[in-house]
C-alpha cells in the first residue's frame, strides 16, 4: 500500500473522523431548518462540502473507487454520499436556471446520518428487506383491489350522480337548458336539493330501498361525481380509488352512505366483504411481512 | 330508447271536450315531471299545464278552469282532459316530460323527452 493509502485507512477507521462525520450532518441539518438564513451561512455551507468532499476522497483513497469488489461505488450507502457531493458543486458552480428544485437535493444530507449511525442502518436494511419480501403480498393486494374495483364498476357505474332535482320548472325550462345555465353553486342549490351544511346535492336512488327525493323533487342522473368529482365508480381508475379509500379506511363510511344511498342497503353487503378482506385481512398481512423481515434481519 | 306517444286528437265543435293522453314507454325508472304545449300554426309554442311525479299541478292562464291534467303513475301516462273547448285552442298538443331511464349497456341516463304531436281542431 502507497503511505498516502495508509494514512487514508488509519483515518477511515478512526472513531473520531466518524464523530466528525456525525456532528457535520447534525449541523448540516440544524443549519437547513433556518428559514431566512444570514449571509455568513453561504461560507459555512462550503465548509460542510468540503468536509463531506474529504470524506469521500478519504473513503477513495483507502478503498478504490470502483474496480475492485470493496470499492468506494460498490457500497451502495456511497452512492448517497456521491450524489449529495455531485447535487453540492452543481449547484455552486454549474448555472442550471431552476436552481431552488436542485436545492432539494439538499435534504439528502440528512440520510447521510443512516450511513454512519450503525443501529440506524441495521433498520433501514430491514425496511429494505421487507420491501423487497413484500412484493408478492403488494401484487396480492393489488390484484384482490382490481377485483372489487371492477365490481364496483359494474354496480355503482354512474350511481354518485343521481341528484334530487326541483321538479317545478318555470314553464320553458328543461333539464337540459338549466344544465347550460349553471354557473355558480347558488344556482345549483336553487334546483338541486342540498342538505344543510352539505356541499354536494342530495343522492338519490330508483330502487325501492335506496335513497328517495323530498317532496316536490324527483331523482335524475345529471352533473358531476359528490367531493368535486373524486368520488366515482365510474371508471376502473376511480373505482380502484375508491376500493383503496375502503382498504385504508380513509373516511370510508361518508363513500359508504353516499353508495347505499344512490344504490341501495342490500349492497351493504359489498362493503362488508371489501372492509374484512381489504381492510381487515391484507393490512394485517402486509404488517405480518413486514414483522418477519425485521425479525430475519435481527437474526 | 324512450318514446312519448300523444292520442286522443281530433276534430271538435266548440264547448265539446277531449282527453289527450301521452304514454311513456322505454325502460323508464322514473318520470318526473310531464308536460302539455301547444303549437297553434303560425304561432310559437305555448305551454298548457304540467304535473310532477308527486301530482303538484299548474296550468296556464288561458286554460285555468278548463283543462284538468292528470297522471297514471303505473302506466307511465299523462292524460289532458279539455273541457269547453274555444276556436284558439285549436294547435298541436304536444308532450314533454323528464324521463330517467335505463338505456344500452344498461346505463341511467335523464332527459327531457318530446312527443309527435296530436292536432286538435275546434270549429263548427
Known amino acids: 500500500f502507497s503511505p498516502l493509502r495508509r494514512i487514508s485507512i488509519k483515518i477511515l477507521v478512526h472513531s473520531l473522523f466518524s464523530m466528525l462525520i456525525m456532528c457535520t450532518i447534525l449541523t448540516n441539518c440544524i443549519f437547513m431548518t433556518m428559514n431566512n438564513p444570514p449571509d455568513w451561512t453561504k461560507n459555512v455551507e462550503y465548509t460542510f462540502t468540503g468536509i463531506y468532499t474529504f470524506e469521500s476522497l478519504v473513503k477513495i483513497l483507502a478503498r478504490g473507487f470502483c474496480v475492485g469488489e470493496f470499492t468506494f461505488l460498490r457500497d451502495p450507502w456511497n452512492w448517497l454520499d456521491f450524489v449529495v457531493i455531485v447535487f453540492a458543486y452543481l449547484t455552486e458552480f454549474v448555472n442550471l436556471g431552476n436552481v431552488s428544485a436542485l436545492r432539494t437535493f439538499r435534504v439528502l444530507r440528512a440520510l447521510k446520518t443512516i450511513s454512519v449511525i450503525p443501529g440506524l442502518k441495521t433498520i433501514v436494511g430491514a425496511l429494505i428487506q421487507s420491501v423487497k419480501k413484500l412484493s408478492d403480498v403488494m401484487i396480492l393486494t393489488v390484484f384482490c383491489l382490481s377485483v372489487f374495483a371492477l365490481i364496483g364498476l359494474q354496480l355503482f357505474m354512474g350511481n354518485l350522480k343521481h341528484k334530487c332535482f326541483r321538479n317545478s320548472l318555470e314553464n320553458n325550462e328543461t333539464l337540459e337548458s338549466i344544465m347550460n345555465t349553471l354557473e355558480s353553486e347558488e344556482d345549483f342549490r336553487k334546483y338541486f336539493y342540498y342538505l344543510e351544511g352539505s356541499k354536494d346535492a342530495l343522492l338519490c336512488g330508483f330502487s325501492t330501498d335506496s335513497g328517495q327525493c323530498p317532496e316536490g323533487y324527483t331523482c335524475v342522473k345529471i352533473g358531476r361525481n359528490p367531493d368535486y368529482g373524486y368520488t366515482s365508480f365510474d371508471t376502473f381508475s376511480w373505482a380502484f380509488l375508491a376500493l383503496f379509500r375502503l382498504m385504508t379506511q380513509d373516511y370510508w363510511e361518508n363513500l359508504y352512505q353516499q353508495t347505499l344511498r344512490a344504490a341501495g342497503k342490500t349492497y351493504m353487503i359489498f362493503f362488508v366483504v371489501v372492509i374484512f378482506l381489504g381492510s381487515f385481512y391484507l393490512i394485517n398481512l402486509i404488517l405480518a411481512v413486514v414483522a418477519m423481515a425485521y425479525e430475519e434481519q435481527n437474526q | 330508447e324512450v318514446q312519448l306517444v300523444e292520442s286522443g286528437g281530433g276534430v271538435v265543435q266548440p264547448g265539446g271536450s277531449l282527453r289527450l293522453s301521452c304514454a311513456a314507454s322505454?325502460?323508464?325508472?322514473?318520470?318526473?315531471?310531464m308536460r302539455w304545449y301547444r303549437q297553434a300554426p303560425g304561432k310559437q309554442r305555448e305551454f298548457v299545464a304540467r304535473i310532477t311525479d308527486d301530482s303538484a299541478t299548474g296550468y296556464a292562464d288561458s286554460v285555468k278552469g278548463r283543462f284538468t291534467i292528470s297522471r297514471d303513475q303505473a302506466k307511465n301516462t299523462v292524460y289532458l282532459q279539455m273541457n269547453s273547448l274555444r276556436p284558439e285552442d285549436t294547435a298541436l298538443y304536444y308532450c314533454?316530460?323528464?324521463?330517467?331511464?335505463?338505456?344500452?349497456?344498461?346505463?341511467?341516463?335523464?332527459?327531457?323527452?318530446w312527443g309527435q304531436g296530436t292536432l286538435v281542431t275546434v270549429s263548427s
Open positions: 322505454g325502460r323508464i325508472l322514473r318520470i318526473g315531471y
Open positions: 314533454e316530460a323528464l324521463v330517467t331511464a335505463s338505456v344500452r349497456g344498461g346505463s341511467i341516463h335523464s332527459g327531457t323527452y
